[in-house]
Structures are given as structure tokens and as C-alpha cells.
Interface confidence: low
Amino acid sequence: RSDQEPLYPVQVSSADARLMVFDKTEGTWRLLCSSRSNARVAGLSCEEMGFLRALTHSELDVRTAGANGTSGFFCVDEGRLPHTQRLLEVISVCDCPRGRFLAAICQDCGRRKLPVDRIVGGRDTSLGRWPWQVSLRYDGAHLCGGSLLSGDWVLTAAHCFPERNRVLSRWRVFAGAVAQASPHGLQLGVQAVVYHGGYLPFRDPNSEENSNDIALVHLSSPLPLTEYIQPVCLPAAGQALVDGKICTVTGWGNTQYYGQQAGVLQEARVPIISNDVCNGADFYGNQIKPKMFCAGYPEGGIDACQGDSGGPFVCEDSISRTPRWRLCGIVSWGTGCALAQKPGVYTKVSDFREWIFQAIKTHSEASGMVTQL
């Protein structure tokens, strides 16, 4: 881990699942004192770190489990807990007289389970390399990409669901393969689509404002997690995009603007471009809104394209000690494909963390097309 990438201030131990929070005043790691709100604290901690949810939580005793390099405790203000999305806002140093602290197992994400060392200028990828990538198919034809957040939730772009494509029984989610034609992939139906109510083209077809291009697809049943099917992590709370960082976009979209879709999943490494640069007159001239970002090369040549829409733009980091891939962007729009000074434009996922968590909690039983602001 480089000096530019410090550890995230909330960590979960891979050894015994203890939750640890960094005390920046003291420069030490503290344990979270057990309370009646353990379930909520575990969930919030996992979400803060970029995991989708806590799977289980438990209580450990410092006398038997040991301090393991931590010193002291944080206690949670249970009165303020229901009104926050940030654990760090509701904790303070305390004694924790019982010596019992919180452990949680978060839903794993962003890691390949195989030993593996639409995209213009990209290359074919190999099975298990991007195990969160799915294909969204309407009437059997690939229309959009998507990213698995769990076995049964896929994050994609709102624009993949115009009025003409809203018969949910005709959608399928294809996962676990890199060849569109693979007989080995798994295919599931769709129970619900939750799209962002602030995506203006759905209200006004003439709108050129593409902010909030985000949607969640709830599968009719969960995909089994295998070597080839794994969820991606979300950005951690407060984690900013790093201009110039090279990340990866994947998809089965067109390999040229007027070309055919790729039969095999493509991957391309492209750098993040600052919004200041991307809003320049020679780039997109103020069309890049705060909840979007650009990625690509000023000279063009490598980019996402039609059919990659909704697919993942992922960046790897080690802020959770273990290297993990995080879904930083969703392929949204662009002028042409791989043109000079017209990079791909992506939905900035970090700005929709709360929208995602809220949608999943609120609409897990919903059916059909659902909108959420």
C-alpha cells in the first residue's frame, strides 16, 4: 500500500472479524464496545467500508480474544445512531467496563476467487477476471452491462430501461461467463428494477441532462457465488476519485462506434480525468455534472461504447488491507466512442452510496419498475 493510500479508518479483522476504528487524535486503533445496537453498528460499519451489508455479527471478550494491537474502546451514541450514515460521527472514547466488543462478517466483495494475474481498444478478458460483470439481455439480446453487488442485486444505468424495455419478464441477467454465447453462464429473471427518480430523460425525453443515470436490478432469485460470479465492492464512505488513477472498464459493447458487439467480454484500462479538464471547451464544455466523471485518454483510442452502458468501471485499492476492486463508475454516456477529447462519461457511484443502501432496504420485496429519488 502506497503512502498516498492510507488505511480506511474503519477495518474488520480477517482473523476474527473484530471491528476496529482509528482514533486519529491518539493515532491508535480502538475496538467498538458492544451495545444493544450491535446489529445496526455492524451494518453501518460494513457499509462504510464499501461492503453491501453485514452478514452476521457477534460479541467477543477482550480478556479471551485479546487486544491484538488495539488500545481501548469507542462507544456508540445509541440516541444519534438512527440519524446518521457515518459511524465516525456517533462514537466517542469510553471505558467499556464489560470488555465486550463487536465483531462482524461483512459480505465479501471485490476479490477474484481465481489465481488470475464493449470496449474500444480493449482486449478479450478471461473467465473469473471480472466476476461481477453481468450482461442484461432483453428478448435474448445483450443491451447493457451491470455489476453484481450481491447474489441478487445488480447495479446498472437507468437509461437501460426506457419505456420500450420495461416488460420485466423479457429481461434476463447473464452471469458467470465471458463469452456472450457461452453455454456455461447462468441466466436469471428479474423481479424488480429500481431506477433513480432524478434521471430527467425519463420525465422529459428532450432532456440532455444525464445526471442520476443509475438503477438497481433485483433478480428473481440469488445467483450462486462461484469462482466466476462474485460481487464488487462499493466505494468506501468519503472515498474520493483520484484524478489520473488508471482503472478498468469492461463490457460486451461495440468494439467500434459503427461496429458489432464483442462476443467476448472486453477490458480496457483508462485513467480518470478531472471534471475541470473534462468540462473544458475542447472536451465536454460544462456537460459534466458533479455526480458524473470522465475517464479515458485525451487522444482517444480506448473507451467504452454502445452496449457497455450500465457496466462497471472498477478501481483497485488496499484501503481495507486486502486489495479489493471497487465500483467507482457506471458506463453512462459519451460522444462517439474513443474519439479524441471525448472520453467516456460515468455515473459517480460514490455519490449514490446512500441511494443504493436505501433502495435495497426499501424495495427488496418490490416487483416491477420502481422509482426512488
Epitope: 428478448d139 447473464f174 457461452s182 447462468l186 450462486p224
Partner: antibody, heavy 118, light 106 residues
Framework: QVQLQQSGPELVKPGASVKVSCKAS????????INWVKQRTGQGLEWIGE????????YSNEKFKGKATLTTDKSSNTAYMQVSSLTSEDSAVYFC???????????WGQGTSVTVSS | ENVLTQSPAIMSASPGEKVTMTCSAS?????MHWYQQKSSTSPKLWIY???KLASGVPGRFSGSGSGNSYSLTIRSMEAEDVATYFC?????????FGGGTKLEIK
């Protein structure tokens, strides 16, 4: 190896129902859809519908809605198709077939002959 | 419903002869699949994703096409190729089969 073993031939009276079974082995039953296909003597193939055992989600050919009912029993790795209100038009060989990710049916049962006769 | 029309309905070829049969779709499809069925047996997946040979299929078979028009070709007819061949599309519901091409040997 992947195998789909179907139940034996049936001779049934008009107006009755018949339930054909398809026992899967050699793969994870819940990971693939099971399709059902009809073939009348000397005729072509007709897709009846498919069922995904993991969730029991079903996609059916409108033509067979109300005629064929698809179910599965995950504990025995078996798919079933019940055909009701039988007429001579339902006399056919019925196949189950495993559906792979791209809709191609890669493994087929041996077929079950259903004859409707009074 | 996407109607698949196969032609010819029946054809015969001499051993060693090149054979081509076609399948026309009323609506464009992403991929076409082909099945071989011999009398009184189950169909077998023969060609999938338009051009890929299923396991155990001899290399003299090939498939091609796009959009609405697809074909299956046998480079050099052999006696064991006598069968009925069905095209099949899975690009839209309901899934549909062609009426079949019955291939006989002269």
C-alpha cells in the same frame, strides 16, 4: 456425465391429465433451466416453456398456458410437466432439455410418449 | 413469434457431396442453433451460437449467417449424416424451432 431421465410412456383417456417427470443427474440441478419441448409424430419441435429450479421462475409459450404446468422438486433433482384436459392433439413425445446460458438446449431427455385415446 | 422457415424441407445428397440447408427468421436473431435428430431418438445440439460445433460433431459440419438468414453446411456428405436438422432461436420469446430439413442419402 449429464443425464436427463424421463418417465415412461403413457396411455391416457381424453379429458384426463398426465404428469411427466425428468430426473437430472451429473450437474447442479438448480444452476440450469429445464425446457420442455413437444414433438408430434412426424412433425417438428415446439417449445412449451422453461422453469428455473433455483427460483421456480417460469417462462411459457402462450400457446401452452393453461395446458401445461411446470414444477420442480429440488430435493430429488426432478422437473415435472403436467398436461391437463388431454385431447388427441396432445398425443406426442414430450422432451425435457437442459437450457444453457444462451438458451441453447445442450442435453435432452430420451422423451416420453403420451398417447390420448379412449 | 419469430417464425423460422427451413429450406428445403427434404433433400438428398450423394456421399462426398456438399450439402447446404438454410433457415430464415421472420425477425432478426442474435444467434442461431442447430439440432440433429435421427429417427426415434432425442434431438442433439449440433451447432450452437451460429457457428460453433457441439462436442463430438465432425469437422465437416459448419454453420454461418447473421440477422435473418442462417445456414448449415456439410462439406462432404456421409451416410451417418442422414437425419432431420432443426434450426432454433433463443433470442426472443417464445423460443422457436424451424420445421426441419430431412436429409437423405442417394
Amino acid at each position: 456425465q449429464v443425464q436427463l431421465q424421463q418417465s415412461g410412456p403413457e396411455l391416457v383417456k381424453p379429458g384426463a391429465s398426465v404428469k411427466v417427470s425428468c430426473k437430472a443427474s451429473g450437474y447442479t440441478f438448480t444452476d440450469f433451466v429445464i425446457n420442455w419441448v413437444k414433438q408430434r409424430t412426424g412433425q417438428g419441435l415446439e417449445w412449451i416453456g422453461e422453469i428455473y429450479p433455483r427460483s421456480n421462475s417460469i417462462y411459457s409459450n402462450e400457446k401452452f398456458k393453461g395446458k401445461a404446468t411446470l414444477t420442480t422438486d429440488k430435493s430429488s433433482n426432478t422437473a415435472y410437466m403436467q398436461v391437463s384436459s388431454l385431447t388427441s392433439e396432445d398425443s406426442a413425445v414430450y422432451f425435457c432439455a437442459r437450457g444453457s446460458g444462451d438458451y441453447a438446449m445442450d442435453y435432452w431427455g430420451q422423451g416420453t410418449s403420451v398417447t390420448v385415446s379412449s | 413469434e419469430n417464425v423460422l422457415t427451413q429450406s428445403p424441407a427434404i433433400m438428398s445428397a450423394s456421399p462426398g457431396e456438399k450439402v447446404t440447408m438454410t433457415c430464415s427468421a421472420s425477425s432478426s436473431v442474435t444467434y442461431m442453433h442447430w439440432y440433429q435428430q435421427k429417427s426415434s431418438t432425442s434431438p442433439k445440439l449440433w451447432i450452437y451460437d451460429t457457428s460453433k460445433l457441439a462436442s463430438g460433431v465432425p469437422g465437416r459440419f459448419s454453420g454461418s449467417g447473421s440477422g435473418n438468414s442462417y445456414s448449415l453446411t456439410i462439406r462432404s456428405m456421409e451416410a451417418e449424416d442422414v437425419a432431420t436438422y432443426f434450426c432454433f432461436q433463443g433470442s426472443g420469446f417464445p423460443l422457436t424451432f424451424g420445421g426441419g430439413t430431412k436429409l437423405e442419402i442417394k
